[in-house]
Interface confidence: medium
Amino acid sequence: KKVVLGKKGDTVELTCTASQKKSIQFHWKNSNQIKILGNQGSFLTKGPSKLNDRADSRRSLWDQGNFPLIIKNLKIEDSDTYICEVEDQKEEVQLLVFGLTANSDTHLLQGQSLTLTLESPPGSSPSVQCRSPRGKNIQGGKTLSVSQLELQDSGTWTCTVLQNQKKVEFKIDIVVLAFQKASSIVYKKEGEQVEFSFPLAFTVEKLTGSGELWWQAERASSSKSWITFDLKNKEVSVKRVTQDPKLQMGKKLPLHLTLPQALPQYAGSGNLTLALEAKTGKLHQEVNLVVMRATQLQKNLTCEVWGPTSPKLMLSLKLENKEAKVSKREKAVWVLNPEAGMWQCLLSDSGQVLLESNIKVLPTWSTPVQP
């Protein structure tokens, strides 16, 4: 018996061939011997089966001795043995229809779980295998679960159902809702304007929700909410903002925040959360601010940084075009009795300068000038 696999919602064509290459009488029946369709001369006739409005044939092939049964908009319950009667012969074809669906929305938050459920006809014992867009293979039976979805899991999942050495393939588009970056760090000199950007890693027609930025300043004992906002059809409106600092927020996506000036008391870490309408859970992006200050007080030239710096970062003080006078893996360095000239304070990571602040030291009879 020939086995044919079909996909729920698709169209399948079951073949039936006579030895004579001409139009002769044929009938297609189901396993209960109920007539589905056949012919009377050159006319297509249909029987009382439940497939009535979804069954068809190709009259153009009858003259070649081919009498296919076409079933449209396949349903799981169409799985059956179909019998073609032609020239006193019976050709049996077993049709097995499968469906694969995501049992929740196909738009899922980063970290959530995806469950794919296989609908299969009674008596079948298929195995399913899916491959994610990043090339991760997973295998299962009637259900297949993937926990802790990552951004790279966004895209088309290719799933293969195997039954009786035959395969049928499904494609499911999954969108993982997340920010493009889990974490970012901004390096600024004291007094500079700070831009925080929170680009999303997905695009949807309408985006509605609400968000908040909580900030833990390095100098503060507890975190506080700096701003809350609403998002309606990709339009941003501020609900509440602190007076110090007074953040400004862009009205359109991507989410964009401006801190008028970087000050040591603002250095620290923030967590922007975004709750989307009709979704449980929130999107998160961490943002860090590192602030640098270079000062000269009497005979002491000091360079300091505040905020979450890695222990491998190097802080240096050097006179322009000269070797570093002092270089330490610390958050403050200083030089006593600095020579006159333009001094540079540098924060660097493996030789790459992340932040630079210049201060002019005048001869001892003058006062310092900070450009």
Partner: antibody, heavy 118, light 108 residues
Framework: EVQLVESGGGLVQPGGSLRLSCAAS????????MHWVRQATGKGLEWVST???????YYPGSVKGRFTISRENAKNSLYLQMNSLRAGDTAVYYC????????????WGQGTTVTVSS | EIMLTQSPGTLSLSPGERATLSCRAS???????LAWYQQKPGQAPRLLIY???SRATGIPDRFSGSGSGTDFTLTISRLEPEDFAVYYC?????????FGPGTKVDFK
């Protein structure tokens, strides 16, 4: 008889391009994942690329952005377009079939040699 | 990236002896996605075992595979002269689909 035959190897200068082909016969080509695997002289096997039955493609970091795998089911053919070639790409390149339902690489070609040298 | 390490690098044995080859993964691999290959000089590799323990078509039953998680083993119960070759394990559970560096089985 199930068979894979690679062609297109040769000598190319660093920075140059080459297109490898793999002709498949004896099986329904469109039903199988196909892979390229390479082996430098005296070294082990290194996976280079995979193309799924749905046309989905996968590469390791070492070739990503330089190599492109493609398939032409109507011609039972697999291809590997290799650009910006480096000396480190010198190897025998094998075309292989992914076994039914991704179960290992069950059919291999005889390989074609690519030499990148000035 | 899942790294595979094979041990020993070389196994020197005589025909008739038992060979035990190890493949260790840097992170857990579903046993469904672990394969073993044999390669002789000047030839393409040949699939021996897929799914960690299933023999490929035409592979003699002296070859067997076992293991799960991060530790997998290929056993050749009685070495035949034609079994002296290099053996590679491969994981195809997660891209990049890495191979182990190989174990050479040679004559003692």
């Amino acid at each position: 008889e199930v068979q894979l035959v690679e062609s297109g190897g040769g000598l190319v200068q660093p920075g140059g391009s080459l297109r490898l082909s793999c002709a498949a016969s004896g099986f329904t080509f469109s039903n199988y994942d196909m892979h390229w695997v390479r082996q430098a002289t005296g070294k082990g096997l290194e996976w280079v690329s995979t193309i799924g039955t749905a046309g989905d493609t996968y590469y390791p970091g070492s070739v990503k952005g330089r190599f492109t795998i493609s398939r032409e089911n109507a011609k039972n053919s697999l291809y590997l377009q290799m650009n910006s070639l480096r000396a480190g790409d010198t190897a025998v390149y094998y075309c292989a079939r992914g076994g039914d339902f991704y179960y290992g690489l069950d059919v291999w070609g005889q390989g074609t040699t690519v030499t990148v040298s000035s | 990236e899942i790294m595979l390490t094979q041990s020993p690098g070389t196994l020197s044995l005589s025909p008739g002896e038992r060979a035990t080859l190890s493949c260790r993964a840097s992170q857990s691999v579903s046993s469904v996605y672990l394969a073993w290959y044999q390669q002789k000089p000047g030839q393409a590799p040949r699939l021996l075992i897929y799914g960690a323990s299933s023999r490929a078509t035409g592979i003699p039953d002296r070859f067997s595979g076992s293991g799960s998680g991060t530790d997998f083993t290929l056993t050749i119960s009685r070495l035949e002269p034609e079994d002296f070759a290099v053996y590679y394990c491969q994981q195809y559970g997660s891209s990049p689909f890495t191979f182990g560096p190989g174990t050479k089985v040679d004559f003692k």
